[in-house]
């Protein structure tokens, strides 16, 4: 599992594969904050449960954040 | 109403190009991936790839991979099928249908959470014929 | 030639109880959840049935799906003059990184 014990970012190594949703079951999202400098995007994959970090600068996960944001703003109070 | 509806079809000569549209509305757009069938005359239903609007991204059977290529505008929740030579072999009913889910929760906390589902194609177009045919 | 494998037909009387099996592999049905869809003469597919043994609403409860390994079951219990059509099973395939369908299996409503 690519995730570090440090009060830093939570991904050590992040893969730099193609995204196929199907293969997901969720992502979750990390915004930049001051223990780490970057979003980091963890993914459980389908099968087994596993953990991969994804590229944030890829251009799926990019769209991604985009559209995460759009709901956000949309919710926001 | 949930609904998704194709046009663009025809009768074209082959060699030429072609675009469908599967507009949809009643749901959120990006929230869901839409997928391309087509059900050749005699034959049985074929998957042709799909796009989740979401991610941006298109996946292609094999089969039609380079052949067809499929896009969407999520600003007017239309999905798209285009290919640039038709052949004769592509004469068929074209579908366009509703598959995966992505719920977007968590969102006002700091670590928001994107739910994926894949649970059959449970919205389909009225369809629409293409005849490749000089 | 079709990824998973379906009779080409099937029938029976009205009242009766049809299966339509499909058969497939590791990398799909082995690993994957089975979808069914019923297409009525002229009209759109619909889904019937969707991971394994789930009915959509408004899907009768005549309609029934399993799945065993590497292979799934429609049950049609009851079965009506409607219920004629082309009934297709489908499931995602691992190795091939897409959908795949079944041949399509014709109902007949004798």
């Known amino acids: 599992v690519p995730l570090s014990r440090t009060v830093r970012c939570t991904c050590i190594s992040i893969s730099n594969q193609p995204v196929n949703p199907r293969s997901l079951e969720k992502l979750e999202i990390i915004p930049a904050s001051q223990f780490c400098p970057r979003v980091e995007i963890i993914a459980t994959m389908k099968k087994k449960g596993e953990k991969r970090c994804l590229n944030p600068e890829s251009k799926a996960i990019k769209n991604l954040l985009k559209a995460v944001s759009k709901e956000r703003s949309k919710r926001s109070p | 109403q949930v609904q998704l509806v194709e046009s663009g079809g025809g009768v074209v000569q082959p060699g030429r190009s072609l675009r469908l549209s599967c507009a949809a509305s009643?749901?959120?757009?990006?929230?869901?991936?839409i997928t391309w069938i087509r059900d050749p005359p005699g034959k049985g239903l074929e998957w042709i790839g799909e796009?989740?609007?979401?991610?941006?991204?298109?996946f292609y059977a094999q089969k039609f991979q380079g052949q067809v290529t499929i896009s969407a505008d999520k600003s007017i929740s239309t999905a798209y099928l285009q290919w640039s030579s038709l052949k004769a072999s592509d004469t068929a009913m074209y579908y366009c249908?509703?598959?995966?889910?992505?719920?977007?929760?968590?969102?006002?906390?700091?670590?928001?959470?994107?739910?994926?589902?894949?649970?059959?194609?449970?919205?389909w177009g009225q369809g629409t014929l293409v005849t490749v045919s000089s | 030639q079709s990824v998973l494998t379906q009779p080409p037909s099937a029938s029976g009387t009205p009242g009766q109880r049809v299966t339509i099996s499909c058969s497939g592999s590791s990398s799909n049905i082995g690993s994957n959840t089975v979808n069914w869809y019923q297409e009525l003469p002229g009209a759109a597919p619909q889904l019937l049935i969707y991971?394994?043994?789930q009915r959509p609403s408004g899907i009768p409860d005549r309609f029934s799906g399993s799945k065993s390994g590497t292979s799934g079951s429609l049950v049609i219990s009851g079965l009506q003059s409607e219920d004629e059509a082309d009934y297709y099973c489908?499931?995602?395939?691992?190795?091939?990184?897409?959908?795949?369908f079944g041949g399509g299996t014709k109902l007949t409503v004798l």
């Open positions: 991971n394994n043994d």
């Open positions: 796009i989740t609007p979401m991610f941006g991204i298109a």
């Open positions: 009643g749901f959120t757009f990006s929230s869901f991936s």
């Open positions: 249908a509703r598959d995966g889910r992505f719920d977007v929760s968590d969102l006002l906390t700091d670590k928001p959470k994107v739910t994926i589902n894949y649970n059959g194609m449970d919205v």
């Open positions: 489908a499931s995602w395939d691992d190795s091939l990184n897409g959908r795949v």
